[in-house]
């Protein structure tokens, strides 16, 4: 039985040109995390494998940094980065857990007047 839950930063906003940390946390389970995939819609950004380390998709290697921890740092943000991001936790013996984050990248002037989304 899958008892775990994924906690995420929820809906977040960031300034164009800036950076943001995408974080998920798996709780309420003793399952072993074997791999975490980070995806934007259906596009793979990165994989963190417990034994093999990180794979950053070549398309994003110049502006995606691994970590902190199992999280992912997006740099040099553009308005096109606005959208849904998913953390997909592969665990043993539970199976797969998925968390969702919505990122809105704002023009600098808008971001200066406060984020539209609050982190829960």
């Amino acid at each position: 039985m899958m008892t775990g839950t994924i906690e995420t930063t929820g809906n977040i906003s960031a300034e164009k040109g800036g950076s943001i940390i995408l974080q998920c946390h798996l709780s309420s389970t003793t399952a072993q995390v074997t791999q975490v995939n980070w995806e934007q819609q259906d596009q793979l950004l990165a994989i963190c494998n417990a034994d093999l380390g990180w794979h950053i998709s070549p398309s994003f290697k110049d502006r995606v940094a691994p970590g902190p921890g199992l999280g992912l740092t997006l740099q040099s943000l553009t308005v096109n980065d606005t959208g849904e991001y998913f953390c997909i936790y592969h665990t043993y013996p539970d199976g797969t857990y998925t968390g969702r984050i919505f990122l809105e990248v704002l023009e600098s002037s808008v971001a200066e007047h406060g984020a539209r989304f609050q982190i829960p």
């Epitope: 074997t34 791999q35 793979l44 494998n49 093999l52 998709s57 070549p58 290697k61 043993y92 797969t96």
Partner: antibody, heavy 119, light 107 residues
């Protein structure tokens, strides 16, 4: 066109070391991880390790961990695999292989380097 | 280590007929499986990754299926140039391991 060109065949004595090179071209070297895989005569494929050419960080197969070192030279877009304390069972073709876009598989392979260990 | 087994060890198929190769894995690897083709005297060539995604430039007579622990590579209509050894490989943990290979010949 992606190309991985490896160094020539080597003959080594037991106990010696060998260093095989793999020169990459046709893509941005630092954007793709590099793997090393070997194949003994008439045998299957055996993974040795991988490296991130950007950071230099590497991961090894525990079987080879004490004897293998994978490095890169970013300026020349070249990856290297050094295997020490050679024994006859290390006689094999050694391949470098570029990691794919979507995970830890290999999408392009070098032509292979034959290493013969014989006294 | 994750253990990969392939069946059959070898098979001979008539030109134009279907060839099916199976790969069984000792533990759940989700869909993290690749297939490679190796012709005599050549380097391996990637055919399929993520169990079913065809690599660039690979003819569509090749297809992959399966998830978890059981996977299949199918050649729908065998051509002379498909004579080779085919290897499965998981791409899920350290060490990455390959199956022992399946030799495909023309009957």
């Amino acid at each position: 066109e992606v190309q991985l060109v490896q160094s020539g065949a080597e003959v080594k004595k037991p106990g010696a070391s060998v260093k095989v090179s793999c020169k990459a071209s046709g893509y941005t070297f630092t954007n793709y991880y590099m793997h090393w895989v070997r194949q003994a005569p008439g045998q299957g494929l055996e993974w040795m390790g991988r490296i991130d050419p950007d950071s230099g960080g590497s991961k090894y197969n525990e079987k080879f961990k004490s004897r293998v070192t994978i490095t890169v030279d970013k300026l020349s877009s070249t990856a290297y695999m050094e295997l020490s304390s050679l024994r006859s069972e290390d006689t094999a073709v050694y391949y470098c292989a570029r990691e794919g876009h979507y995970g830890f598989y290999s999408d392009y392979w070098g032509q292979g380097t034959t290493v013969t260990v014989s006294s | 280590d994750i253990v990969m087994t392939q069946s059959p060890d070898s098979l001979a198929v008539s030109l134009g007929e279907r060839a099916t190769i199976n790969c069984r894995v000792s533990e759940n690897i989700y869909s993290y499986l690749a297939w490679y083709q190796q012709k005599p005297g050549q380097s391996p060539k990637l055919l399929v990754y993520n169990a079913k995604t065809l690599a660039e430039g690979v003819p569509d007579r090749f297809s992959g299926s399966g998830s978890g622990t059981d996977f299949t590579l199918t050649i729908s209509s065998l051509q002379a140039e498909d004579v080779a050894v085919y290897y499965c490989q998981h791409h899920y943990g350290n060490p990455l391991t390959f199956g022992p290979g399946t030799k495909v010949d023309i009957k």
